[in-house]
Interface confidence: low
């Protein structure tokens, strides 16, 4: 009777890195000839294992194929990679010159489950300001199967992406996902986080997260005020320049007298607000007895390499 090649499993699923067994049994020991495993069909099929003396890395026979009565030609593939996905065929040959293929199994489709890489979130190269719309991109790669879920959150609130694409669109050994979301910045966002969450069958309901701290992508410009305090003595006037609610910390403050630089401040002791922004107060003591005429004092604040913010205050002469 004609030999039958039995591959009982139509398909198997295996996690990348794990091992899988592909079952194959024959109904007859005759005719004499080798059994070989291939991935794919036709001219492009790839030899995976041959029950001969050849060595095949990562592939071993499950049973003792040297035993004359053996009908089990199952193989174990270890350390499976996404590149191992495909349909595997157990093929019986009749010995000859050359060997002749006489029967093939029905094929076993191997689906390789590969975990996505940890999502990486990238934002704009330059800091944005409150009310500005900025885009964030999340990327993850190397996963299989193709089905994947990606969600965006900002401070616990789900955001709707502008675009999410999984590539390639056709069948492949592994896939990549890229998603873009648009966030409207506000002045309270210094402590905010944008989170990209990826869920996949391989992750056991524990999604992977990528985080972007908005503190790296926002600039909140200070509000600058100059005030004159009540004089502590007849000869002294106290001026205060207050820069409020700014981020990041990078701040330079210059006092000018009638347009001439009088003092350079490099703030060290900034006050941090609960919303993550900073305040800075600079005191400038004016010796009023030295000024017979009105003097214009200017507080010039340079924040994060932006154009200077200037506030003037006139101290009346004595």
């Amino acid at each position: 009777t004609e030999v039958k090649v039995i591959q009982p499993e139509k398909s198997v699923s295996v996690a990348a890195g794990d091992s899988t067994v592909l079952n194959c049994t024959l109904t007859s020991l005759l005719p004499v000839g080798p059994i070989r495993w291939y991935r794919g069909v036709g001219q492009s099929r790839q030899l995976i294992y041959s029950f001969t003396t050849e060595h095949f890395p990562r592939v071993t026979n499950v049973s003792d194929a040297t035993k004359r009565s053996n009908l089990d030609f199952s193989i174990r593939i270890s350390n499976v990679t996404p590149e191992d996905a495909g349909t595997y065929y157990c093929v019986k040959f009749q010995r000859g010159s050359p060997d002749t293929e006489i029967q093939s199994g029905g094929g076993t489709e191997v689906y390789v489950l590969a975990k996505p890489s940890p999502p990486e979130v990238s934002g704009p190269a330059d800091r944005g300001i409150p009310d500005q719309k900025v885009n964030f991109t999340c990327k993850s790669h190397g996963f299989s199967p193709r089905n994947i879920t990606l969600k965006w959150f900002k401070d616990g609130q789900e955001l709707h992406p502008l675009e999410t694409t999984v590539n390639p669109s056709g069948k492949n050994v592994s896939y990549n996902i890229s998603s873009t979301v648009r966030v409207v910045l506000n002045s309270m966002d210094v402590n905010s986080k944008v989170i990209c969450e990826v869920a996949h069958i391989t992750l056991d309901r524990s999604p992977l997260r990528g985080i972007a701290n908005l503190s790296n992508f926002i600039r909140v410009s200070p509000t600058v005020k100059v005030t004159q305090q009540s004089p502590t003595s007849m000869n002294q006037v106290n001026l205060t320049c207050r820069a409020e609610r700014f981020y990041p910390e990078d701040l330079q403050l210059i006092w000018l007298e009638n347009g001439n630089v009088s003092r350079n401040d490099t703030p060290k002791n900034l006050t941090k607000n609960t919303d993550g922004t900073y305040n800075y107060t600079s005191l400038f003591l004016v010796n009023s007895s030295a000024h017979r005429e009105d003097v214009v004092f200017t507080c010039q604040v340079k924040h994060d390499q932006q154009p200077a913010i200037t506030r003037n205050h006139t101290v009346l002469g004595f």
Partner: antibody, heavy 119, light 107 residues
Amino acid sequence: QVQLQESGPGLVKPSQTLSLTCTVSGGSISSGGYYWSWIRQHPGKGLEWIGAIYYSGPIYYNPSLKSRVTISVDTSKNQFSLKLSSVTAADTAVYYCSKEGYHSGMDVWGQGTTVTVSS
Amino acid sequence: DIQMTQSPSSLSASVGDRVTITCQASDDISDYLNWYQQKPGKAPKLLIYDASNIEDGVPSRFSGSGSGTDFTFTISSLQPEDIATYYCQQFAYLPWTFGGGTKVEIK
């Protein structure tokens, strides 16, 4: 031309075991290359696959019934059989046996046998 | 388990009409899908295997197509003897599962 014929009691009492046999004629069950399946159909409902066997050993069951099902083959009688334990009224159905080829679906079916579970 | 969702559950068409039934799998099943016809009081009969291959002896008015998750079964010109319930069945994954069936009637 392979033909299949189911046989077994038409009435089974609750909690007992349902036993059916499928006799293969016109071909040998041991010729290889085929799945031999059991399928059932509840009254007025769709088809439910119970399980399948290949003569040389591998047996597959529907997980929803696995704890109660046994499928076996007797090549000497050219038969395969189904046992379903701890039956309830929900197991009342028409039971079919079928032959499954690798590339040809369930290409041969028995005519079906009605099993009623009632006391 | 793979869920097979068939639609519509029933339809009524005139003789000569083109009839289309769809079957959706809950996961990718490649082309591992069969279509069966079941007439009242009879066993199912295999019509289409591997999604698109017509079984020997089946009239050419029956055809199937699709791959992955979405499949279509078509009767190009409905005949009175086609009154039956049609089922899709996947065999990519165990347990093999059937669609809920589509009952075809003549107007």
